[in-house]
C-alpha cells in the first residue's frame, strides 16, 4: 500500500476486562465524513469489517462483535462492551468521502490477577541436598497480560544464582483468555533459613498504572543435622524431695534425634539408662534424694547412626531426713525439768524450731528445748520442725508427747443437762492424767470408753431418764495409781413452754429425740454451762 511506511502510531486505548472500551474515530473533517464510516478489527494482519456508520446511523456486522458494539458521541465513538483479552487488537475507522482515510486504535486489555496463592514444600528441605529443592510455589490466577513474579526472602528480592537459587515460571491460558502464572522457587537452603520468611509478589499493569499483590509470608521446614546436645532441668533452681522434676534432652538439629538419658552410678562408675517418656523426657515424680547424681544425654541420628553426648549435669534433690527427738516418750513429775533434743540430716543447712502442738506457738528457735518447773498444763504435744530456709517448703516435723505424772484431772467439775423424762440420754465425761485414768459411772447404763491421746480418756454413757435419776444426778469418777476425781452432771427437766430464747439461765436445750416408749434413736447432747468450771 503506497505510503504505509509513514503510517502514524495507533492511538492507545487501555481498558480493564469486563468494562467498556470507547473507540473514538480521530479522523478530521478534512480526512473524511464521520457520518459515513466503516469500522474494522485487525487480527493477524487480517482486517474484518465489524460496524458501518451511514448517515450517522450504526449497524453491526454479523460476527463476534455483533452484540457488543454501539455508537456514542454523535457517531464519532464506537463503544465496545464486555471487553475480553481476545479484544486486544487494532481497530480502525475508515472515512469514505472525500477520499478514503483511516485512523488506527490499539486496544490494550488488562486484568489484575487474583491474590497469589503460595504453597510451601510440605516435606521440608534438607540443608545437605545436592541440588536446589522446590521450596515453594506461587500461583497467580486469571491475570492479563501475564504478571511478573518476584520472590522475596526476609524482605529482599531473590535473584537467580547458579546451583543456589532457581526460579522456574510457566503460564497457562484459560478458556477466558486470561493467564494463570505458576512460579516455582528452587533453592539450596542453609540452617539459618529455618526462620526465613518467604513470599512472592505479582507485578501487573492496569490502565491506572503499575500495581502489585503480595502473598502471605511462609516459613519452610528446614532439616539440618544435630551438632550440639544438652540437658535442661525443670523446674529451674533448687529442687527438693516431692517435686515433679523433668529432665529434658535437647538438640539443635531438625528433626530432633532419638534421645537416651543415663545416670552415673557412683558405686559402679557406669552410666545406667533411665526410662524416658515418648518425648524423651525423664520425669521424676516425686523426686527423691536417690535421684541426685550426674545425668547425661545421648542423641542418635538413626540415618547415620552417629551419636552425640551432652555435657553431664549434676542434679541435686535436696532433702531433710526423718526428724529424731530424744527422749522419744518423755514422762516427768510436776516441778521437774526436761531437755528435748531434735536431730535431722539434710543436703543443706538446717534450722530448727520447737512449737507447742495445741497452739502452734513457737517456743524455741534451735534444736534444744529446755522446760523447767513443769506443771500439769505442760503435758501434751511438742513439735520439732527441721527446715531449710533457702528452699521454701522443704521441712520435716516430729511430734513428741510429754506426760506429767499426776492424779486424774477432770474436764469439768459439774455440769447441768436439760432433759425430758423417759428420753435416752447420751452423757460424756473426759479426764486426763498420767498414768492414763479409767472412768466409772455411778448409774447403770451402756458405757463406752475411748482414748483421746495417751494421757486423756473420754467415756460416754447411754442412760434412760427416770425420776430417780432426776433426783440423784449422775457422777463419773476417774482414777489412776495416783488418785481419783469426780464430775457431777445435774439433770433438769425442760419445760418447753416456759423456756424462752433469751433465757440466761442455761445455754439452751440439748438436741434430743424424746420417745417415752422407744429407747432406740433417743439421744441427748448436753451443753456446758457458761460459768467457769473448776478443774482438778
Amino acid at each position: 500500500v503506497p505510503g504505509e511506511a509513514e503510517q502514524p502510531a495507533p492511538e492507545l486505548v487501555e481498558v480493564e476486562v469486563g468494562s467498556t472500551a470507547l473507540l473514538k474515530c480521530g479522523l478530521s473533517q478534512s480526512q473524511g465524513n464521520l457520518s459515513h464510516v466503516d469500522w474494522f478489527s485487525v487480527h493477524k494482519e487480517k482486517r474484518t469489517l465489524i460496524f458501518r456508520v451511514r448517515q450517522g446511523q450504526g449497524q453491526s456486522e454479523p460476527g463476534e462483535y455483533e452484540q457488543r458494539l454501539s455508537l456514542q458521541d454523535r457517531g464519532a465513538t464506537l463503544a465496545l462492551t464486555q471487553v475480553t483479552p481476545q479484544d486486544e487488537r487494532i481497530f480502525l475507522c475508515q472515512g469514505k468521502r472525500p477520499r478514503s482515510q483511516e485512523y488506527r486504535i490499539q486496544l490494550r486489555v488488562y486484568k489484575a490477577p487474583e491474590e497469589p496463592n503460595i504453597q510451601v514444600n510440605p516435606l521440608g528441605i534438607p540443608v545437605n541436598s545436592k541440588e536446589p529443592e522446590e521450596v515453594a510455589t506461587c500461583v497467580g490466577r486469571n491475570g492479563y497480560p501475564i504478571p511478573q513474579v518476584i520472590w522475596y526472602k526476609n524482605g529482599r528480592p531473590l535473584k537467580e544464582e547458579k546451583n543456589r537459587v532457581h526460579i522456574q515460571s510457566s503460564q497457562t491460558v484459560e478458556s477466558s483468555g486470561l493467564y494463570t502464572l505458576q512460579s516455582i522457587l528452587k533453592a539450596q537452603l542453609v540452617k539459618e533459613d529455618k526462620d526465613a520468611q518467604f513470599y512472592c509478589e505479582l507485578n501487573y499493569r492496569l490502565p491506572s498504572g503499575n500495581h502489585m499483590k503480595e502473598s502471605r509470608e511462609v516459613t519452610v521446614p528446614v532439616f539440618y543435622p544435630t551438632e550440639k546436645v544438652w540437658l535442661e532441668v525443670e523446674p529451674v533452681g533448687m529442687l527438693k524431695e516431692g517435686d515433679r522434676v523433668e529432665i529434658r534432652c535437647l538438640a539443635d538439629g531438625n528433626p530432633p534425634p532419638h534421645f537416651s538419658i543415663s545416670k552415673g552410678n557412683p558405686s559402679t562408675r557406669e552410666a545406667e539408662e533411665e526410662t524416658t517418656n515418648d518425648n524423651g523426657v525423664l520425669v521424676l515424680e516425686p523426686a527423691r534424694k536417690e535421684h541426685s547424681g550426674r545425668y547425661e544425654c545421648q542423641a542418635w541420628n538413626l540415618d547415620t547412626m552417629i551419636s552425640l553426648l551432652s555435657e553431664p549435669q549434676e542434679l541435686l534433690v535436696n532433702y531433710v531426713s526423718d526428724v529424731r527427738v530424744s527422749p522419744a516418750a518423755p514422762e516427768r513429775q510436776e516441778g521437774s525439768s526436761l531437755t528435748l533434743t531434735c536431730e535431722a540430716e539434710s543436703s543443706q543447712d538446717l534450722e530448727f524450731q520447737w512449737l507447742r502442738e495445741e497452739t502452734d506457738q513457737v517456743l524455741e528457735r534451735g534444736p534444744v528445748l529446755q522446760l523447767h518447773d513443769l506443771k500439769r498444763e505442760a503435758g501434751g504435744g511438742y513439735r520439732c520442725v527441721a527446715s531449710v530456709p533457702s528452699i521454701p517448703g522443704l521441712n520435716r516435723t516430729q511430734l513428741v508427747k510429754l506426760a506429767i505424772f499426776g492424779p486424774p484431772w477432770m474436764a469439768f467439775k459439774e455440769r447441768k443437762v436439760w432433759v425430758k423424762e423417759n428420753m435416752v440420754l447420751n452423757l460424756s465425761c473426759e479426764a486426763s492424767g498420767h498414768p492414763r485414768p479409767t472412768i466409772s459411772w455411778n448409774v447403770n447404763g451402756t458405757a463406752s470408753e475411748g482414748d483421746q491421746d495417751p494421757q486423756r480418756v473420754l467415756s460416754t454413757l447411754n442412760v434412760l431418764v427416770t425420776p430417780e435419776l432426776l433426783e440423784t444426778g449422775v457422777e463419773c469418777t476417774a482414777s489412776n495409781d495416783l488418785g481419783k476425781n469426780t464430775s457431777i452432771l445435774f439433770l433438769e427437766l425442760v419445760n418447753l413452754t416456759t423456756l424462752t430464747p433469751d433465757s440466761n439461765t442455761t445455754t439452751g436445750l440439748s438436741t434430743s429425740t424424746a420417745s417415752p416408749h422407744t429407747r432406740a434413736n433417743s439421744t441427748s447432747t448436753e451443753r456446758k454451762l457458761p460459768e467457769p468450771e473448776s478443774r482438778g
Epitope: 504453597q119 541436598s129 541440588e131 529443592e133
Partner: antibody, heavy 116, light 106 residues
C-alpha cells in the same frame, strides 16, 4: 505422555523384605518428585515415602525405621524397600508424581499380599 | 500430624442432584488441599488442587472451595460415571488423606 508403573512381588512372607520399583516415562525424576502411597483392601489411602526432584528422601514416621527410598535417574526408576513385612502391610502400593507438591499422576498400583 | 476428616462417609443421590462432600483439617492448611476420585478397582484421579483449581481434563461440574480448615467438593449435577470414592488430601505439612466418601446413585 506421563506414565508410572509399579512392579514387584505379589506375595511376601511375614518378616521378609518387600522391594517395589516404580518406572516412569514422560518426565524426568530430576524435574519431579515421586511418592509411594498404599491402600489396604477397603481402606483409605496412606502416604509412605517420597523422593524429591533434588534427590532428598522423606518417610512417614510410622514406618521410618523399615523404609528406604532411592532412585536411579538413568533408568527413570524409584525403588522402595520395606523390611519386616507383616500381614497388616497387605495393600495396593501406588507410586505418584509430584507437581510439585500435590500428586497429579498415579501408577496403576500393585497388590502386595503378606501371608505365610 | 495433621488429620483430615471427611463427611459423610457415604451418600446416595439421584442423577442430576447437586452433591457436596466436606473435609475438615485438624489445623489451618490454607489452600494446600487436593481432591481425588477413585472408581472401584481403579487408580485415584486428581480432580482439584490448591483447594479450588480444576485439574486439566476434569469436567466443570466438579468444583472445590474452602480455605484454612474447612473444604468442600461439589458435583453440581451428579452423573452415573461419578459413582466412586472421593478422598481429600492435605499437602501443607507432610501428606495425609481423609477417610473417603463413597458416592452412589439412588
Amino acid at each position: 505422555q506421563v506414565t508410572l508403573k509399579e512392579s514387584g512381588p505379589v506375595l511376601v512372607k511375614p518378616t521378609e523384605t518387600l522391594t517395589l520399583t516404580c518406572t516412569v516415562s514422560g518426565f524426568s525424576l530430576t524435574s519431579n518428585g515421586v511418592s509411594w502411597v498404599r491402600q489396604p483392601p477397603g481402606k483409605a489411602l496412606e502416604w509412605i515415602a517420597a523422593i524429591s526432584s533434588g534427590g532428598s528422601t522423606y518417610y512417614n514416621s510410622a514406618f521410618k525405621s523399615r523404609l528406604t527410598i532411592s532412585r536411579d535417574t538413568s533408568k527413570s526408576q524409584v525403588v522402595l524397600t520395606m523390611t519386616n513385612m507383616d500381614p497388616v502391610d497387605t495393600a495396593t502400593y501406588y507410586c505418584a508424581r509430584h507437581r510439585p507438591f500435590y500428586f497429579d499422576y498415579w501408577g496403576q498400583g500393585t497388590l502386595v499380599t503378606v501371608s505365610s | 500430624d495433621i488429620q483430615m476428616t471427611q463427611s459423610p462417609s457415604s451418600l446416595s443421590a439421584s442423577v442430576g442432584d447437586r452433591v457436596t462432600i466436606n473435609c475438615k483439617g485438624s489445623q489451618n492448611i490454607y489452600k494446600s488441599l487436593a481432591w481425588f476420585q477413585q472408581k472401584p478397582g481403579k487408580v485415584p484421579k486428581l480432580l482439584i488442587y490448591d483447594a479450588n483449581s480444576l485439574q486439566t481434563g476434569i469436567p466443570s461440574r466438579f468444583s472445590g472451595s474452602g480455605s484454612g480448615t474447612d473444604f468442600t467438593l461439589t458435583i453440581s449435577s451428579l452423573q452415573p460415571e461419578d459413582v466412586a470414592t472421593y478422598y481429600c488430601q492435605q499437602y501443607y505439612s507432610g501428606y495425609t488423606f481423609g477417610g473417603g466418601t463413597k458416592v452412589e446413585i439412588k
